[in-house]
Amino acid sequence: MNGRVDYLVTEEEINLTRGPSGLGFNIVGGTDQQYVSNDSGIYVSRIKENGAAALDGRLQEGDKILSVNGQDLKNLLHQDAVDLFRNAGYAVSLRVQHRLQVQNGPIGHRGEGDPSG
């Protein structure tokens, strides 16, 4: 029997220092560009090689960004979210939600599961 797929959701505060080429990532989402059904949140779609985010190592593709410098990203148009990042200054604090896929074993198995993704 196949196990079901569950998700372990954690939150983290990530402080980035803007590098010579910026923060070094792309985003999708917003009220006018829903990336996840019924969720207008902002998601990291690309971490650029050798950019500030990649060098820091904590931000991951697929993470949901909840706030920038304490400002909530809920219910923002996509371009407004983009502008918020671009105007966020030199030191940028991100509150992010990581979603780790966990493959559970068959029913009755009480192991921790096999993280993947």
Epitope: G22, G24, F25, N26, V28, S45, R46, I47, Q79, F85
Partner: nanobody, 128 residues
Framework: DVQLVESGGGLVQAGGSLRLSCAAS????????MGWFRQRPGKERDVVAT????????YYLDSVKGRFTISRDNAKNTVFLQMNSLKPEDTAVYYC??????????????????????WGQGTQVTVS
Amino acid sequence: DVQLVESGGGLVQAGGSLRLSCAASGRPFSSLDMGWFRQRPGKERDVVATINWTGDSTYYLDSVKGRFTISRDNAKNTVFLQMNSLKPEDTAVYYCAARGGGSSVDSEYDVGGFEYDYWGQGTQVTVS
């Protein structure tokens, strides 16, 4: 990480057609910009065609315009390259490539160019 597997290559006569497919796995396909590149014998790897994550923007190498068509099927996690009116100079190893799409948080002018983060192993196309 993203895994890419190309298929559909082969030997075809000049004037013929082939349809290349690239199946992606490892993360949501709908957020990926996709591209097809080729490496001809003794040459650098060149971009052939690209399609952005929303499917509303495409690019074609001048020499394939009107002959090749890139498309994507998000339901099947697959990108296609329909190649018609093939010429001997189209002979090459064709590679599928992917990167995260969306908007750069750094600059409106940073559209990524032809820099891709994930690559397939390639499929040989030979036009005789």
